[in-house]
């Protein structure tokens, strides 16, 4: 059991066993490694508190091995709390657990997560809670956890995580969908930014689209178009130094989450991460979800902007791609809130309509 | 102790609107929900919405989300409520509420009785 | 919102006897259910919490039981300062009172 105090009140209580599935270089090309949170695994004093009022919010460290770090950042509002980020550090000059390993450095990988209960509940998922950050996977299992706690032990009441409610019995009737669907005509583009203390930190605008394969409970397997409808969707995000996220709320059923991370040593930004969560009604499994944290997308050097009038391809996972549709994006830097130099995406430089953005 | 002070009783004519204030003490403002109840005898006892001061995340009942606006300054530990466009329907007595560790609304303010005529 | 049904409106029994009133919410509300008395000129007081959780000071008489939609509080020995109207809360999804139910004694 994983505890925070302020004056001998606990405030966060957590317990879980984790596996970080991690991604590193050698020599002779990628290698992965899986690491357990051990039993030694403890909380980090000084790297956790309650968070002060108008400065901070709660915050769980745990520490284990040579370096080792998990941190889980609360945050809440009248009637919910949840895990905003999540973050990890590890140290690949540790040659137990990355054998050779090219780099020495020790790195540090962060992610918004679906973690999220209601006030005065716990969170409990006994299935596996993922997060997928750049080159690593957290995965929690069995956990309970539950901030801005005010007696000292979790609550009687538990908020469960999607992956361990049942499948609702009874759906309602969905239409009948072709299969193939008739493709849908191209997404409306729509502009998106994101800003933190230091002002903007993502200015995007692009047309999307969802290419969903999956398997209907008529177990005939379809693939389906979906256009993001600006006007139904809403747009928030989070400015970090080595993480920027642009999450879209879509007509009430879609979580789609961009994630943009930084290459310090080459000054690029780029699309590194995309997770869905909707919901399709005549799926066999309506709750379609889908995550890669390990994308190299839309790369410009940081200060400019990626333009790309060409659509473009962004495969996600086998049954999930978005499609992308007259995008220009900049990520990290922006100057006074405009785009800066334009970087061409090679379809468009190669296009015979090749057209000149000053 | 936990002490919730409420503004003093109001009239007000039809149509104008009112704005009443909760002043809490004896414990740390950002870290409860303020709730707000409505008392008629009409109607009985209405939850009217809630407001955590710590972000100003306020949500509201449906049957008041446009007649209450609810507010919250940290620096003097007040939550405020303004109820607009009054009719003879809104006069009650108003309570601000603090709820506690899943224990419904504990801590009572006094009561705001607001009388609307014309 | 969560609805909440409550019911007799009113009642009327003698001293001594006993009362019990229901409350019937439109969806599970894992048993965060709280019971109030009220009275007039003064400010609700709350009895019971959790379902079936005596508040300090509370005198036994008072009780509630219940899960999922449906719940029940009983009045048991009726005395002459139980005459007041009594409430129902859930507060499992944001917050919603019952109608109320006035209760006199014969």
């Known amino acids: 059991l994983f505890e925070v105090k302020n004056n001998g009140t606990t405030c966060i209580m957590a317990s879980f066993s984790a596996s970080f599935l991690t991604t590193y270089e050698t020599a002779n090309g990628s290698q992965i490694v899986n690491i357990s949170l051990p039993a030694s695994a403890e909380v980090l004093k000084n790297g956790s508190s309650c968070g002060k009022e108008n400065v901070s919010d709660p915050s769980l460290t745990i520490t284990f091995g040579r370096g080792y770090l998990l941190t889980l950042n609360f945050t809440r509002n009248a009637t919910r709390y949840s895990v905003q980020l999540m973050s990890f550090v590890y140290n690949l000059s540790d040659t137990h657990l990355f054998p050779n390993a090219s780099s020495k450095e020790i790195k540090t990988v962060e992610s918004i997560t679906d973690i999220r209960a209601d006030i005065d509940k716990k969170y409990r998922c006994v299935s596996g809670t993922q997060v997928h950050m750049n080159n690593v996977t957290v995965t929690l299992h069995d956990a309970t956890i539950q901030a801005y706690l005010s007696n000292s032990s979790f609550s009687r009441g538990e908020t469960r995580c999607e992956q361990d409610r049942p499948s609702p019995t009874t759906a309602p009737p969905a239409p009948p969908s072709p299969s193939p669907s008739p493709v849908p005509k191209s997404p409306s583009v729509d502009k998106y930014n994101v800003s933190g203390t230091n002002g903007t930190c993502l200015l995007a605008s692009m047309g999307l689209q969802l290419n969903l394969t999956y398997e209907r409970k008529d177990n005939t397997t379809v693939t389906r178009l979906l256009n993001i409808n600006p006007n139904k969707t809403s747009a928030s995000g989070s400015c970090g130094a080595h993480l920027v996220t642009l999450e879209l709320h879509s007509e009430g059923t879609t979580v789609l989450l961009f994630q943009f991370g930084m290459n310090a040593s080459s000054s690029r930004f780029f699309l590194q991460g995309i997770q869905l969560n909707t919901i399709l009604p005549d799926a066999r499994d309506p709750a379609f979800k889908a995550a890669n944290g390990s994308l190299r997308a839309l790369q410009a050097t940081v200060g400019n902007s990626y333009k790309c009038n060409a659509e473009e391809h962004v495969r996600v996972t086998k049954a999930f791609s978005v499609n992308i549709f007259k995008v220009w994006v900049q990520a990290f830097k922006v100057e006074g809130g405009q785009f800066g130099s334009v970087e061409e995406c090679l379809l468009d430089e190669n296009s015979m309509h090749h057209h000149h953005h000053h | 102790q936990v002490q919730l002070q409420q503004s003093g009783a109001e009239l007000v004519k039809p149509g104008a609107s009112v704005k009443m204030s909760c002043k809490a003490s004896?414990?740390?403002?950002?870290?409860?929900?303020i709730h707000w109840v409505k008392k008629s005898p009409g109607q009985g006892l209405e939850w009217i919405g809630a407001?955590?001061?710590?972000?100003?995340?306020?949500p509201y009942s449906q049957k008041f989300k446009d007649k209450a606006t609810l507010t919250a300054d940290k620096s003097s530990s007040t939550t405020y409520m303004q109820l607009s466009r009054l009719t003879s329907e809104d006069s009650a007595v108003y309570y601000c509420?603090?709820?506690?560790?899943?224990?419904?609304?504990?801590?009572w303010g006094q009561g705001t009785l607001v009388s609307v005529s014309a | 919102d969560i609805q909440m049904t409550q019911s007799p409106p009113s009642l009327s029994a003698s001293l001594g006897g006993k009362v019990t009133i229901t409350c019937k919410a439109s969806?599970?509300?894992?048993?965060?259910m709280a019971w109030y008395q009220d009275k007039p000129g003064k400010g609700p007081r709350l009895l019971i919490h959790?379902?079936?959780t005596l508040q300090p000071g509370i005198p036994s008489r008072f009780s509630g039981s219940g899960s999922g939609r449906d719940y029940s509080f009983s009045i048991s020995n009726l005395e002459p300062e139980d005459i007041a109207t009594y409430y129902c809360?859930?507060?499992?999804?944001?917050?919603?009172f019952g109608g109320g139910t006035k209760l006199e004694i014969k």
């Open positions: 509420v603090r709820a506690n560790w899943d224990v419904a609304f504990a801590y």
């Open positions: 407001i955590y001061p710590g972000n100003g995340d306020a």
């Open positions: 969806q599970d509300i894992d048993r965060y």
């Open positions: 004896g414990y740390i403002f950002t870290n409860y929900n």
């Open positions: 959790d379902t079936s």
């Open positions: 809360l859930q507060y499992d999804n944001l917050w919603t």
